[in-house]
């Protein structure tokens, strides 16, 4: 009997407010054993996949995307699905990120306060892949 | 099909170096961590390096008994593998293997490069 | 680093014997256990990962079981073709680590 798969989540840091110009990591989690993330764009009309996952959690697994330099492009809604076979999880909510304009000079923050400000600590370091997922007939557009 | 053809391997001497290279086709390399693993002969498998993808950095690691010897890189461009081998020592004697990995599992191998080093 | 004890280097078996290889991590690695099978002259080929999870291709005489320390690999009928070296891997954490393999051998 196949299991439930649990639905996936979704964070950014240093956060959802960024600098024009200032990098972005979005990342997605689920259960041991995912194969494959994906990040979806704007009701799934983009994507980017990765099969580079690593070991979150005695009971998760994760995966991220990185934007170097954000573009105002950039800004919209952003959820994750993940393929754990034989089958693709539920999208997670969505994440909005949010560009704005930089303000002053090179001591500006780069985050909102009450934002993550670096990577969550993860107790366990790997990564992750195995057979390319199905489409579900969508176009790999890239996302950055 | 995933193909991975290791390359660069031969005879070198001690505190020598050689750099050996892999040719992956068939799947998406630049979303891939890739690894190598080698087993010397009549031993058991033992893993060397790991680097992941960009999206993670192209982060490295290492084994300890490699650390500040081995350099794992990559060229997403050209879908290719690298590890460069200083200072190599008879005990880095063994069959490399080129490996698309799980997180952290190896999935899918390359036949392996010999590598022997002698005086 | 996470040492992986096998249960022997060598088992002498029969043709149709169900035949059970285990693995003893140090620590808990939270069902991050892989297994494969090697062949003389012949890269390794994943079997299972996740500790249960069979890769395609693989025969389902083939299972695998266990979580925290302790994880087993399994063939309830032991083919010609399954005379080999199996290793177990734990991928909880860096460096991995392979058990040191146990070859199966045809009384």
């Known amino acids: 009997q196949e299991e439930d798969l649990p639905r996936p989540s979704i964070s950014a840091e240093p956060g959802t407010v960024i600098p024009l110009g200032s990098h972005v990591t979005f990342v997605c989690r689920g259960p041991v054993g995912v194969q494959t993330f994906r990040l979806e764009r704007d009701s799934r009309s983009t994507y980017n996949d990765t099969e580079d996952v690593s070991q979150a959690s005695p009971s998760e697994s994760e995966a991220r995307f990185r934007i170097d330099s954000v573009r105002e492009g950039n800004a919209g809604l952003y959820r994750c699905i993940y393929y754990k076979p034989p089958k693709w999880s539920e999208q997670s909510d969505y994440l909005e990120l949010l560009v704005k304009e930089s303000s002053g000079g090179p001591d500006s923050p780069d985050t909102e306060p009450g934002s993550s400000a670096g990577p969550t600590q993860r107790p366990s370091d790997n990564s992750h892949n195995e057979h390319a997922p199905a489409s579900q007939g969508l176009k790999a557009e890239h996302l950055y | 099909e995933v193909q991975l053809v290791e390359s660069g391997g031969g005879l070198v001497q001690p505190k020598g170096s050689l750099k050996l290279s892999c040719a992956a086709s068939g799947f998406t390399f630049n979303t891939n961590a890739m690894y190598w693993v080698r087993q010397a002969p009549g031993k058991g498998l033992e893993w060397v390096a790991r680097?992941?993808?960009?999206?993670?950095?192209?982060?490295?690691y290492y084994a300890d008994s490699v650390k500040d010897r081995f350099t794992i890189s990559r060229d997403d461009s050209q879908s290719m593998l690298y590890l460069q081998m200083n200072n190599l020592k008879t005990e880095d004697t063994a069959r490399y293997y080129c490996?698309?990995?799980?997180?952290?599992?190896?999935?899918?191998w390359g036949q392996g490069t010999l590598v022997t080093v002698s005086a | 680093d996470i040492q992986m004890a096998q249960s022997s280097s060598s088992f002498s078996v029969s043709l149709g014997d169900r035949v059970t290889i285990t693995c003893k991590a140090s620590e808990d690695i939270y069902i991050r256990l892989a297994w494969y099978q090697q062949k003389p002259g012949n890269a390794p080929r994943l079997l299972i990962s996740t500790a249960t999870s069979l890769e395609t291709g693989v025969p389902s005489r083939f299972s695998g079981s266990g979580s925290g320390k302790d994880y087993t690999l399994s063939i309830t009928s032991l083919q010609t073709e399954d005379v080999a070296t199996y290793y177990c891997q734990q991928y909880w954490s860096t460096p991995y680590t392979f058990g040191g393999g146990t070859r199966l051998e045809i009384k």
């Open positions: 490996v698309r990995g799980g997180s952290g599992f190896f999935a899918y």
């Open positions: 680097i992941r993808s960009k999206s993670s950095n192209y982060a490295t």
